[in-house]
């Protein structure tokens, strides 16, 4: 399927947001660093099917969404800019649904793809623990924006590379 | 494939102005910091300081705060050194290196080729 | 600032030796300890970081090891493309620092 034009704007935008959430001097927080355990894996360029992969980029942005649309991310993070975040996240959603519906057939997810969307909600339960074990902190939420502007911008390649194999 | 270019080699008199740059490729600029090291002649590495080229954030080592200046463009993806005012001590090399920031990636795993800036008069 | 003790300061070696360079963190470090290789007139080079990490297209030869404040640098069988200068860093916090450096020479 086609991810319409605005899909890849919508990329962008939310990634400019994420920089925006900035709250901290992160040069503070290098004590904080911690190994999330990316599923790269799920991202890299394998025998990947057009519909596994847009399951798994469904998976990752609404994990995303889950995770700052807590009560702790709208206190430490800034509420207009949430708000525009989710407006962007929610775009996504939409759009990736409606590949999954041409490419499968059906919204959800199909249970060959398990493996690889238990591997992206792993890897949110690490980061979610670990915002947990480190109190919610401002290092804390430092060091998981960038975690999620780099995994964001995995996405961003994979469906770069999905939308150039047409 | 990533490079950091770095600026060719100066020769400067005390007292005289210098900015050395380094520019990134192959890579999100500004998804990196980039930071600046120190090696004098016959002796070891020193840190200088490190910049964030998205927002321009820089922190310093205490040996080199005040003495030099780092700053970045992201628009030409370049990061700079710079100098206001040379010291016959200031004879080194410098190499800039990036860093991964706050993610867990490896530290300082592509460097410039470094550019030798002598001071004498 | 975190000091960084690299032992022993110079060391002369055989090809085949394994080969053995300690460093040593004033305070706890946690794992965020990185190894570089750097040869006359060229930049440095990273080997291991986060204490033990092999980094992308580093012989396996080296292996790095430690936690806390005791780190070592390894490598099983010298070969002659070896002989340099390494050095140890510490990522734990600002300001960076690094060892003095380790010089591996021909015996």
């Known amino acids: 399927c086609d991810l319409p034009q605005t899909h890849s704007l919508g990329n962008r935008r939310a990634l400019i947001l994420l920089a925006q959430m900035r709250r901290i001097s992160p040069f503070s927080c290098l004590k904080d660093r911690h190994d999330f355990e990316f599923p790269q894996e799920e991202f890299d360029d394998k025998q990947f099917q057009k519909a596994q992969a847009i399951s798994v980029l469904h998976e990752m942005i609404q994990q995303t969404f889950n995770l700052f649309s807590t009560k702790d991310s709208s206190a430490a993070l800034d509420e207009t800019l949430l708000d525009e975040f989710y407006i962007e996240l929610d775009q996504q959603l939409n759009d990736l649904e409606s590949c999954v519906m041409q490419e499968v057939g059906v919204i959800e997810s199909p249970l060959m793809y398990e493996d690889s969307i238990l591997a992206v909600r792993k890897y949110f339960q690490r980061i979610t623990l670990y915002l947990t074990e480190k109190k919610y902190s401002s290092c804390a939420w430092e060091v998981v924006r960038a975690e999620i502007m780099r995994s964001f911008s995995l996405s961003i390649n994979l469906q770069k590379r999905l939308k150039s194999k047409e | 494939e990533v490079q950091l270019v770095q600026s060719g080699a100066e020769v400067k008199k005390p007292g005289e102005s210098l900015k050395i740059s380094c520019k990134g490729s192959g890579y999100s600029f500004t998804s990196y910091w980039i930071g600046w090291v120190r090696q004098m002649p016959g002796k070891g590495l020193e840190w200088m300081g490190i910049i964030d080229p998205s927002d321009s954030d820089t922190a310093y080592s205490p040996s080199f705060q005040g003495q030099v200046t780092i700053s970045a463009d992201k628009s030409i993806s370049t990061a700079y050194l710079q100098w206001s005012s040379l010291k016959a001590s200031d004879t080194a090399m410098y190499y800039c290196?990036?860093?991964?920031?706050?993610?867990?990636?490896?530290?300082?795993?592509?460097w410039g080729q470094g550019t030798l800036v002598t001071v004498s008069s | 600032d975190i000091q960084m003790t690299q032992s022993p300061s110079s060391l002369s070696a055989s090809v085949g030796d394994r080969v053995t360079i300690t460093c040593r963190a004033s305070?706890?470090?946690?794992?965020?300890l990185n190894w570089y290789q750097q040869k006359p007139g060229k930049a440095p080079k990273l080997l291991i970081y986060?204490?033990?990490s092999l980094q992308s297209g580093v012989p396996s030869r080296f292996s790095g090891s430690g936690s806390g404040t005791d780190f070592t640098l390894t490598i099983s069988s010298l070969q002659p493309e070896d002989f340099a200068t390494y050095y140890c860093?510490?990522?734990?916090?600002?300001?960076?620092?690094f060892g003095q450096g380790t010089k591996v020479e021909i015996k």
């Open positions: 290196a990036r860093h991964p920031g706050l993610n867990w990636a490896p530290d300082f795993d592509y």
């Open positions: 860093q510490q990522s734990y916090d600002f300001p960076l620092t």
């Open positions: 986060f204490a033990s």
């Open positions: 305070q706890s470090i946690g794992k965020s």
